[in-house]
Interface confidence: low
Amino acid sequence: EDLKKVFPPKVAVFEPSEAEISHTQKATLVCLATGFYPDHVELSWWVNGKEVHSGVSTDPQPLKEQPALEDSRYSLSSRLRVSATFWHNPRNHFRCQVQFYGLSEDDEWTEDRDKPITQKISAEAWGRADC
Amino acid sequence: PYIQNPDPAVYQLRGSKSNDTSVCLFTDFDSVMNVSQSKDSDVHITDKTVLDMRSMDFKSNGAVAWSNKSDFACTSAFKDSVIPADTFFPSPESSC
């Protein structure tokens, strides 16, 4: 891999649709990690400071953003689904954390560095009691 | 997995003001339904994955589409997949 071409992901959490909440009494948060290269990432969801697995579904592998390009950057998505009441409790805190093995854009790369930095990038949301 | 009561729907999700990415969630569809990749290189669609809400004994299929295109709309996001017309739930404009 070209060690000079390392891009950390941008991470964003998208909040549930009110339409979904009213229609199903469930709420799905979506986490997107985009624009990263190479494709070594681990994504996890944290609710109120604890990692959760129930209600989580993450893409089995990152998606090439430009499939025609050999060195395309990658994206990964994940869903977290909770009950509507759990989402509407404003004290509940949701965080999507993406662990990326590589360099942040501000890091220097030196040839004798024997292992990549582990960079944690996260995005957060809070339950919504109102607007 | 067998989805007990499929209720296919496409929802538009909202990110932050500073985020120009639009996200569409296709969820609660039957396992026989396939999600096609987009022919538009600026629209990204994931494969379907299964989500298990163990505490509610509830499983659902889902896929996500997103794009930075200003004219991207959820009604057209999954246009290459066979989705009933009544599946789309418009996002009411937020009063926030």
Partner: nanobody, 117 residues
Framework: DVQLVESGGGVVQPGGSLRLSCVAS????????YGWYRQAPGKEREKVAH???????DYADSAKGRFTISRDESKNTVYLQMNSLRPEDTAAYYC???????????WGQGTLVTVSS
């Protein structure tokens, strides 16, 4: 938008106390998380203390037992009471506010705390 203005920094002797204030203005009804962070010269910014709208607090190990975070909802103000100050507490202290959906993430300009004899 949200604006955060910190105050209360200054020079204090080791063992002394300071109280930092962070006044929030703008869309403050959206905020349900405040934090104090600090950055010493040549070091990375680090968490000092957090407080949620439920008044749940969380402290860095270095702040436990010496610092107290609190808030006055009626004044839209968050405080950091710092006791038993040490030279290693010398840093710029920043207030942070998180709104209900990331990344409505706001920072103040900082206030300088110098602990020196």
């Amino acid at each position: 938008d949200v604006q955060l203005v910190e105050s209360g920094g200054g020079v204090v002797q080791p063992g002394g106390s300071l109280r930092l204030s962070c006044v929030a203005s703008g869309y403050v009804h959206k905020i349900n998380f405040y934090g104090w962070y600090r950055q010493a010269p040549g070091k990375e910014r680090e968490k000092v203390a957090h407080i949620s709208i439920g008044d749940q607090t969380d402290y860095a190990d270095s702040a436990k037992g010496r610092f107290t975070i609190s808030r006055d909802e009626s004044k839209n103000t968050v405080y950091l009471q710092m006791n038993s100050l040490r030279p290693e507490d010398t840093a710029a202290y920043y207030c942070r506010a998180l709104s209900r959906i990331w990344p409505y993430d706001y920072w103040g300009q900082g206030t300088l705390v110098t602990v020196s004899s």
